[in-house]
Every structure is written in structure tokens, then in C-alpha cells.
Amino acid sequence: AGVFELQIHSFGPGPGPGAPRSPCSARLPCRLFFRVCLKPGLSEEAAESPCALGAALSARGPVYTEQPGAPAPDLPLPDGLLQVPFRDAWPGTFSFIIETWREELGDQIGGPAWSLLARVAGRRRLAAGGPWARDIQRAGAWELRFSYRARCEPPAVGTACTRLCRPRSAPSRCGPGLRPCAPLEDECEAPLVCRAGCSPEHGFCEQPGECRCLEGWTGPLCTVPVSTSSCLSPRGPSSATTGCLVPGPGPCDGNPCANGGSCSETPRSFECTCPRGFYGLRCEVSGVTCADGPCFNGGLCVGGADPDSAYICHCPPGFQGSNCEKRVDRCSLQPCRNGGLCLDLGHALRCRCRAGFAGPRCEHDLDDCAGRACANGGTCVEGGGAHRCSCALGFGGRDCRERADPCAARPCAHGGRCYAHFSGLVCACAPGYMGARCEFPVHPDGASALPAAPPGLRPGDPQRYL
């Protein structure tokens, strides 16, 4: 399980001639919001096909009114990320549709009207847990700039969110065959499905259905503490078979040999048998030389001065890694303070600051009650140069903008799935139902049972695609 996150950076006229007219006017002020639809794989499905990986709506952006005679600028955007939770494995390859919607705020009968301004689509490969990927897409004369990533929700880890992590059983290291869960170094990778009843504290498995015991435990489910009296030798057979308590970690525990090397103990330490192409004490040295052209992206290969570094790639600006294979993401330097969102624009770093913070690195705290509002009826309380909001019932968060779990009351009808959302909640309806709360059945002939203008929903509302 995990979350796909989409951050919209800008939406405005693309380069070149034929700038689009502003979607809003003094007579018709409007605001933008976005919808993202995700599908697994690289299939080019129709926009209307189900968003099998999930979908999300953004909050509404600030109200915008065109200045007469001015060209359409980048339009003001909603705050926050669009988040699409996924329940199963992250597929690695996916298709996306991002729609930009306009909400007109004039005096229409029946409330605001929605219309689709632009739709972009694409197919991408993406590993979960990786850095933000940046993208620019054009739709007609409009240009959308955005970043996206997929991250796993604990205890899942890995590029597909299929590995699980659990707290370490032993204080110093993980059990045999289990690796630390980077970056959660205090947790260990946990196998997916062990034999039923296998002790979660003292057992583990490398194949589904097995139950292997950690040192000091034995029995078919690793629930029996071993006796210490029947040891055959100082490092005799495994505790799982003999009931013998094995002494502390041996030099090969955790396999110090890199790159697929196999470890064997020696009287003083250990020895690695390295696969072809690697050597060194821990098989950490690659046998590749500059003749093999190992440097990517224009990196300059220099032969190492000794066998330990058969070559070194001197990377051109903008690239890093032992083979210059990685584009430098300067956001990896963590330059933004106070939860600011980092954007590496190539020519410069930018930090998009959270409300209440300012400065090129979001280092300045603007927090005091002067000129500061707590949303939804909250009141601002000053103290020590900072501020906090005392929120009205049903709201929480720093500025009282967050509803207190809007899904708790199970508001989505007919088996719809509820997602807590910046602007309240969003219902993902079961097949055959639609509406803000999935309250309207869709007739088999395609006509909907919508009333003429239900409050807060129109037939064109993008929620009907969720």
C-alpha cells in the first residue's frame, strides 16, 4: 500500500504564439482545481475508462479575476498535493490523466458551473520511494508543470511497496537473511507470509510458508527457548535443529560481501568469493575499466591509481553517481526549511513555503496573529512570538483548515470508498453509482437519476468520473 503524490507547480500559457485567453474575467471570476486519474501499466486507454489505480481531486484554488487587456498569466493554484492512495503493489509503470477544471463563480442559476479547461495524459515508469519526478505537459495553448512520486505507507517498503518492515527482534541486527529496511535502519525487512502461527518475534521466513528461528529459539513455530547445554561446538549446527544457543554474531553474519559475493569464515575473520567482474576484500571493486565506457552523460573516465578504483567518473555539472548515471537533484540537499517544498528548476533552486513561512529557503517564520486568520471560525492565540489557532469543533490543524476525519461518519453511500481530502472528503463510487456521496444510481440506459440541479453537484462535476 502507498500513496501517489502529485504537486502542480504552474498552469498557464505555453511558450510560442497564440496565447490563450484568460479563463476568468471581471464579469466571470473563477478558480481552478485539478483531477488526476491513474491506471496501471502503459496502456493507452480512453479518458473515460476506470481509474483502476485511483483518482483524486485537488482543493479549489484562489479566486482569480482577469485584469482587462492583460495576457493570461500563470493562474493561481490550489494549495497542497493531490494524493491518490493505492491499496496493493505499486505497478512501476502507469498511465495518468491530469485535468484542469475551471469553476465559474458568477451568478449562475443553481450555483457554480464547472468546465474542463485542459487535459493532459502520459505513460511513465516510476519506482516507489524514489525522488520527485518533474514533468511539463502541453494541452493546446496551455502548459502544465508538475512533479510526482509514489511512496509506500509503513510497513510497506521497496520499489513496489511489496516488502514489509517490522521492528528489529534483536537490538543489534536483523535476523538471518533479513536486511535492514533503508531508510528505517532500526527496522528489518519482514517476509510476506510465513507459516501460520510462526512467532513474529522469534521466527522469520525467506520462502512463503516456512518458519525459521532466530538465535535462541526453536520449535516448529519458533516459540520454544533453546537450552544452552547441548552445544556440539562453539559455532555448531543451527539453533533451529539442535536446540543449541549459538554464541554472538559470526564474521559472515549479515554477509559482508557485496555484489553477490559469498562469504566463508576463516580462523581470523572472513573471506569473500567474488563473482566475475568484482574483486576486493568485500567484492566492492568492479573489474570494469575505462575501456568499457562506464561513464554516462558525458562523464570523463579516469583510470584509478590503484586496483581499488579501476576507474573514476568525473561527472559534468548536473550529474552524479559513481557512473554519472544520476541527475543531480539538488533538492536532495534538503535546502528548504519549515516543511517547504523544494523545486530544482535546473538554473536555480526554489522553495515553495508553507503558510506562515517566507524567505528563499522558507527560513522566516511569519507566525503571529497580525494579519493572520484561523479558518473555519478558529481564533488566533499568540504566545512567545508564535501563534496557534484554537479551532472550532470539527476542525483541526495549524490553521483550522483540516476537518476532523470527515470519513469517520462513513458518508459514502452504496459501498463508495471515502478519502479524507483537503476540501473535505471525496467519495470513490462503486460501479453503478455517482454523485458527491455516491447517492445517485446510474440507470442502465446511461441516463442518470440526478435531479435538475442538486446542491453542490452538476452533471458535469468531475467527481462523477471517480
Epitope: A182, P183, S332, L333, P335, C351
Partner: antibody
């Protein structure tokens, strides 16, 4: 207050491995990247690279690729520098330093590594 | 890589003097220039970041200026505790690079 406390001096032989620790306190460890700087005896400062404390991803300057490895123990708010297959020219003081978005604003006291046969 | 040059490797001055240490970059570094002080015991402290901003806890007698490729650190009223080596460092482009240092001594 913010502090970076490094492990003590090390005396090693060529070919051995050393692992230096840098324990941070007084701030949220995963909010700031950690950087490593080398100073050979009587010489200036040389930036070695950094590690992203949120993701664990390191970045190395060209001269420190191969035998050098940055790592973390996030639960202990500690960053590590490991140097494998030590050489005489690795004799230096190694500093860890926190990066605040503009500069390395707090530094460890330095760890002296002497490589001698 | 961007080269940082501190032309003066050592400097003697009297207590109370106004001292200026200069630093030049091999290309425009857009004000991403920092100054560090290394005391004789080896401890390193940030003095000035982003050309002219004083780090917290640093006495106001320290100031920084410059733009483009040329930058300087000024100590307006030299005190005994300022005896140290001063390094400039550019943070505009990876890899970050330091100047060779300027050692400040008392006459």
C-alpha cells in the same frame, strides 16, 4: 542547543577500514542534510559530499567516489563516514556539518584519522 | 568545478584594526558565498552566509559583502578571539568548493 558530536581519533594501518560517527542533537535530524569535509594536515577544507537524512541517499564529490561511504542510523540521529582500504593520504581530520539551505551552519569537532604502517 | 581563490594566505593586524579578507570565484556564484572561521584548536564555525547575512551568535563586528565573483569579509574592530583561519566557500554549484584560507595573526 544544536550539537554535532563526532567519535574519537583513530589510528589505522593501510588497507584497514575506519568508520566515523557524527551524533546530532538539538534539532530534527531528518530535516537537514549532513555533509562531510576533509582537512589534511596543514591544508584547507575539502567538501566530500552529503547524505540526505530523509531518504538515506548519498552524493559524493568526484575525489571521494569508491572507497568512501556515507550512511545513517536515523533512530540514533547519527551519520557515519566509512573509509575502506585506507591509504596514507587519508590521514586527515574529518568533519561532519549540517546544511541549512545556505551554508553548513553547525560543525562537529572533527575526528582525526591517522593512517600509518 | 568552481575555483575559489583567497589571494592572501596570511595576514597580520593589530587589535582594534579593521581587517578585510577577500575571496574570488572562477565564475559568478550568485551571492551563494559563505565564510567560516577555524580556530587554532580546529573547531569550525559559520560566520556569514549568503554573502552578507550574519549567522546567529556571531558578533556584529563581522560583516560580508560582494557580488558576482568578488567577495569580502570584514572585521571592523579586531579582537584577540578573532585569531583564526578564515575560509570562503561557494554553495552555488556542486561540488561545493572552499578557498585556501587566510590565517589571521596579531602583530
Amino acid at each position: 542547543q544544536i550539537q554535532l558530536v563526532q567519535s574519537g581519533p583513530e589510528l589505522k594501518k593501510p588497507g584497514e577500514t575506519v568508520k566515523i560517527s557524527c551524533k546530532a542533537s538539538g534539532y530534527t535530524f531528518t530535516d537537514y542534510s549532513m555533509h562531510w569535509v576533509k582537512q589534511a594536515p596543514g591544508k584547507g577544507l575539502k567538501w566530500m559530499g552529503w547524505i540526505n537524512t530523509e531518504t538515506g541517499e548519498p552524493g559524493y564529490a568526484d575525489d571521494f567516489k569508491g572507497r568512501f561511504a556515507f550512511s545513517l542510523e536515523t533512530s540514533a540521529s547519527t551519520a557515519y563516514l566509512q573509509i575502506n582500504n585506507l591509504k596514507n593520504e587519508d590521514t586527515a581530520t574529518y568533519f561532519c556539518a549540517r546544511y541549512d539551505g545556505y551554508a553548513m551552519d553547525y560543525w562537529g569537532q572533527g575526528t582525526s584519522v591517522t593512517v600509518s604502517s | 568545478d568552481i575555483q575559489m581563490t583567497q589571494t592572501t594566505s596570511s595576514l597580520s593586524a593589530s587589535l582594534g584594526d579593521r581587517v578585510t579578507i577577500s575571496c574570488r570565484a572562477s565564475q559568478d556564484i550568485s551571492n551563494y558565498l559563505n565564510w567560516y572561521q577555524q580556530k587554532p584548536d580546529g573547531t569550525v564555525k559559520l560566520l556569514i552566509y549568503y554573502t552578507s547575512h550574519l549567522h546567529s551568535g556571531v558578533p556584529s563586528r563581522f560583516s560580508g559583502s560582494g557580488s558576482g565573483t568578488d567577495y569580502s569579509l570584514t572585521i571592523s574592530n579586531l579582537e584577540l578571539e578573532d585569531i583564526a583561519t578564515y575560509f570562503c566557500q561557494q554553495g552555488d554549484m556542486l561540488p561545493w568548493t572552499f578557498g585556501g584560507g587566510t590565517k589571521l595573526e596579531i602583530k
